[in-house]
Amino acid sequence: QNASRGRRQRRMHPNVSQGCQGGCATCSDYNGCLSCKPRLFFALERIGMKQIGVCLSSCPSGYYGTRYPDINKCTKCKADCDTCFNKNFCTKCKSGFYLHLGKCLDNCPEGLEANNHTMECVSIVHCEVSEWNPWSPCTKKGKTCGFKRGTETRVREIIQHPSAKGNLCPPTNETRKCTVQRKKCQKGERGKKGRERKRKKPNKGESKEAIPDSKSLESSKEIPEQRENKQQQKKRKVQDKQKSVSVSTVH
């Protein structure tokens, strides 16, 4: 409906169909088109003080087409509407109005929000996240061996990002402390993170280990491991289970 206007020809013969051009079925020298060929719309074009009939393949912007058996007419959309299918069904509002269900509104109704890009009232979209993925293996400084207490992480994906007024997304990362059976590292066994890491000189009594990058989700500084008798170890294991800490990243 936003199409170009039909061209009006200069020479028109009074009421003689075969002399009409530009889509006219009948025309006159003074009034231009009087009727149009099928599937064309009749519209009045003002030229100075005079109104001339023209036949258009579609109605100009701000007008809509109505069909009648004898003529198809272009009629103006409502004042607040730029393009429409009819007076009750706007498809694009004038500046400063928001489109909702074919109507142009100053403000969006309750439960909807204004999209200032499309100038529409849209449903408030809340964040949607997937189920948690399984916990990662228990690691410490990228290794799954050579320690007793480490951290494990799990993630979930954002399925639906929220709109401006929507609920924010809950955390998508979660890290907690974990306990593993002490396992000696095999010769040359490396961290699971398959990425080159900066190395630092080991402290006295420390084995040379890869340092996790600053983004590592370790929840707290690791307590240096001390030698404990079997009873103390058991006791600590129970306490650790109860003390499972979660650290979350909010998006």
Epitope: Q1, N2, A3, R39, F41, S57, S58, Y64, G65, T66, R67, Y68, N72, T75, T83, F85, N86, K87, N88, F89, T91, K92, L101, G102, K103
Partner: antibody
Framework: QVQLVQSGAEVKKPGASVKVSCKAS????????IHWVRQAPGQGLEWIGY????????GYNQKFKNRVTMTVDTSYSTAYMELSRLRSEDTAVYYC??????????WGQGTTLTVSS | DIVLTQSPASLAVSLGQRATISCKAS??????????MNWYQQKPGQPPKLLIY???NLESGIPARFSGSGSGTDFTLNIHPVEEEDAATYYC?????????FGAGTKLELK
């Protein structure tokens, strides 16, 4: 004469997306809006939305708003309707139609979409 | 949304007789003196075909045995005399408001 020719049948899994095309001929493509309507097996007709080929402006039935995208390629006089996050209830015949002065006067032959796991 | 209720859901008519299908809208589909109601015919495996536009106007190429009437919320499609090729499902459709809606359809069978 006016003709709307649609792409062939599609079989998709739940969660996937589908893009149906509608090639127009026999008239000036930018003159009329193109609408999409669907019909589930043995059911009635349901309006999905429209697009103006002249400027790409589109509007959708609220029911489909977050899942449907309509586009046009005026150089090929073709309209497209993409439906995402498919579910079994989307199994239907999808029609494109020209909208002339508030009625659907020409229709495509329909594209059958089957959504099944 | 404007709900269109068609009745009957199906009807069987003898050749040469009259078939009358009703369509009631949940709110008026009239505006500025125009009725935004259309009627379509659909045969199995085919797309719908426009019969009547603006409540009472016959689409070009459609036989004169089809006629439409009504305004506001009550509309009727008449087929008289019914011919064999008229066996199909008929739908009313309103264009007055967003979203555009269709009736559930009326299946016409021949006795």
């Amino acid at each position: 004469q006016v003709q709307l020719v649609q792409s062939g049948a599609e079989v998709k899994k739940p969660g996937a997306s589908v893009k149906v095309s509608c090639k127009a001929s026999g008239y000036t493509f930018t003159d009329y809006s193109i609408h999409w309507v669907r019909q589930a097996p043995g059911q009635g007709l349901e309006w999905i939305g429209y697009i103006y080929p002249s400027n790409g402006d589109s509007g959708y039935n609220q029911k489909f708003k977050n899942r449907v995208t309509m586009t046009v390629d005026t150089s090929y006089s073709t309209a497209y309707m993409e439906l995402s996050r498919l579910r079994s209830e989307d199994t239907a015949v999808y029609y494109c139609a020209t909208y002339f002065a508030n009625n659907f006067d020409y229709w495509g032959q329909g594209t059958t979409l089957t959504v099944s796991s | 949304d404007i709900v269109l209720t068609q009745s009957p859901a199906s009807l069987a008519v003898s050749l040469g007789q009259r078939a009358t299908i009703s369509c009631k809208a949940s709110q008026s589909v009239d505006y500025d003196g125009d009725s935004y109601m259309n009627w379509y015919q659909q045969k199995p495996g085919q797309p719908p075909k426009l019969l009547i536009y603006a409540a009472s106007n016959l689409e070009s190429g459609i036989p004169a045995r089809f006629s439409g009437s009504g305004s506001g919320t009550d509309f009727t499609l008449n087929i008289h005399p019914v011919e064999e090729e008229d066996a199909a499902t008929y739908y009313c459709q309103q264009s007055n408001e967003d979203p555009l809606t269709f009736g559930a359809g009326t299946k016409l069978e021949l006795k």
